[in-house]
Amino acid sequence: TRPHGSPGPLQCYSVGPLGILNCSWEPLGDLETPPVLYHQSQKYHPNRVWEVKVPSKQSWVTIPREQFTMADKLLIWGTQKGRPLWSSVSVNLETQMKPDTPQIFSQVDISEEATLEATVQWAPPVWPPQKVLICQFRYKECQAETWTRLEPQLKTDGLTPVEMQNLEPGTCYQVSGRCQVENGYPWGEWSSPLSFQTPFLDPEDVWVSGTVCETSGKRAALLVWKDPRPCVQVTYTVWFGAGDITTTQEEVPCCKSPVPAWMEWAVVSPGNSTSWVPPTNLSLVCLAPESAPCDVGVSSADGSPGIKVTWKQGTRKPLEYVVDWAQDGDSLDKLNWTRLPPGNLSTLLPGEFKGGVPYRITVTAVYSGGLAAAPSVWGFREELVPLAGPAVWRLPDDPPGTPVVAWGEVPRHQLRGQATHYTFCIQSRGLSTVCRNVSSQTQTATLPNLHLGSFKLWVTVSTVAGQGPPGPNLSLHLPDNRIRWK
C-alpha cells in the first residue's frame, strides 16, 4: 500500500474504436497546479517522448491516437511542479484495452424443466475487433439491489449463450454483461441491462372440493389447485363452461374459485395467460355411480401417522384415481388430495393425522368424460374417549303413563370416534343408579314399571377408546309428567 496522502497509482488503457488512450489517477493533494503526463514508445520510437498537459483540477486525460502506434508498448509517467508523481507505468497497447459492452439480444428463451431457466443470445463488442475477449454476465430480479454473477465466464470465440437457472415464475429479471481482453485488463463497463419477464407457471394440480355431484340440491363446490411456487404472489384466470356457455373469472387469488351451478368443465391458467394447458383442464361432469370405485375401506396405518385407504374398481378402468381428505368442520378450501394411476387400488395418505379427529375421505375415479365418486368414508387415525354426552328429552308416553325418552347424537368432533354403544342411566331420589347399554343404532328408550316420584336420567356414549361423560340430565316427575331440565 502506498504511504497515506501520496497520490494513487496511474492507470492507462486504450478505449473504443478510435483507440484513444485514457489515463486516470486519484485526485492530487494540490489541485491548483495541473500535472503533466509523459509517454515514450518502447517498441517503435524509443527516442520520442510526448508531453500531455492536463487541465486544472482534472484527474484524467486522454492521449490522442496520433501520438502513439497501435500494438506499441508505452512508458508513462507524470510530474507536478517538475517533481515525479508516480512510479512510471508500462502500458501494453495490445492487452490494456477496455472493450466496449457486449450486445445482449432481446429474444429470451424460457424453458420449464425441473426448474425455470432462461437462455439469452449475445454478440461480442464491436471493439476491439479480431481480439478474443472473455465476457462476464450477471443477473438480478428487477427490484433487487445486488447482482448474481454467472459462471463460467464466456469467450467470444465460442459465443455460448448466457444461461440463468432456478428463476422464479412471474418475475422481472435483468441481465447485463461486460468484457475483457483475454489475459489483459481492465474490464469494460457493464452493458445497460436487458429486462425480461418469466412466465407464470400453470397450476400443478386442479381438483374440486365439495358436493359437485350432489343430487339433493345442496351443491356447493369449490375448484381448488396447488400453487406451483407458494412464495410468489400470482393471480389466476378461471374458465368454467357448459355447452355453449363459458364464464370467466379473472384476477382470482390462489388457489380456489367457487364452481357455478351446472358447469361441465373448468380450466385454470396463471395471470392473464390464454394458453390452456391440458393438465389444468378438469371435467366436472358426474358419471353414473357404477363407474365409481366401490368397497372403500379406511384404517389407521400400523406404525405410521398416516391413514390407509383401499378400494375396488367400478365397472370400468379410469384414467386415474383421486383420493381426497379433509378434517371434520374444515372449509372446502382446506382439502388435501393425491392422484394415483389406475392400477393402484390403495394408498397411504401422507401427513400428520390427529387422534380423535374425524377425516372425511373420498375416492373418485377420473375419466376423460367426467368424475365418479364413491360415498365418502369417515375415518380416524385413532379413536379417543368422547368429550360430551348426548342431550336427552322426553317424548309422548307410550302407552299413557309409560315415559319414553330420546337422545341426540354427539357432534362428530366431540364424539372423537364411532359410537359403539350408548349407556342409558336412571337414578331415583335416594336410590341407586341403574344403567344399561343400548346399541349405537338406538336413540330412544321406554321406561316401564317406574314407581311414583322424581328421577334423573342421562346418557353417555362410548367409542372403542372408552365411555364419555354424561350428557345433560333430564329431570322426570311421575305421575305429573312435567319435565324440568337441570
Epitope: G297, S299, S300, A301, D302, T310, I361, F380, E383, S439
Partner: nanobody, 123 residues
C-alpha cells in the same frame, strides 16, 4: 397393545360343526374378523363384526353356514361354523383393526393378528 388368541380348532367330519373363539385383550379396535388360509392359497376373509355396533359381514362362500358374534362379557368374538365342507379346511386367523367403510374382509386393514388355529374337515 392388542393381544388376540384363537381357540376351538380341530378335526371334524363333513357336515359337522365347530366353534372358534378369539379372545381380545387391551384393544382399541372397532372391527374383528376371521380369515383363513389353505395350503398353497391366498388368505381370504370369512366373516367380520363391528365391535359394539354388532354389524356383521360374510364371504359368499360361508353365508348361511357360519355365524360371527361377540360376547361382551367375555371379550370374545366367536365363529360358529355349521355344515362344514372339506373346502373349509384351512388355518383360521382372528384379526382386529380400527377399520371404517366397506372393506370388511380386506386383510390390509387389519393390523392385529392371532397365531391361528387349524380346522380340518374330512369327507
Amino acid at each position: 397393545q392388542v393381544q388376540l388368541q384363537e381357540s376351538g380348532g380341530g378335526s371334524v367330519q363333513a357336515g359337522g360343526s365347530l366353534r372358534l373363539s378369539c379372545a381380545a385383550s387391551g384393544y382399541s379396535i372397532n372391527r374383528m374378523g376371521w380369515f383363513r388360509q389353505a395350503p398353497g392359497k391366498e388368505r381370504e376373509g370369512v366373516a367380520a363384526i363391528s365391535i359394539g355396533g354388532g354389524q356383521t359381514y360374510y364371504a359368499d362362500s360361508v353365508k348361511g353356514r357360519f355365524t360371527i358374534s361377540q360376547d361382551n362379557a367375555k371379550n370374545t368374538v366367536d365363529l360358529q361354523m355349521n355344515s362344514l365342507k372339506p373346502e373349509d379346511t384351512a388355518m383360521y386367523y382372528c384379526a382386529a383393526g380400527l377399520v371404517y367403510g366397506e372393506a370388511w374382509l380386506d386383510s390390509r386393514h387389519y393390523n392385529k393378528w392371532g397365531q391361528g388355529t387349524q380346522v380340518t374337515v374330512s369327507s
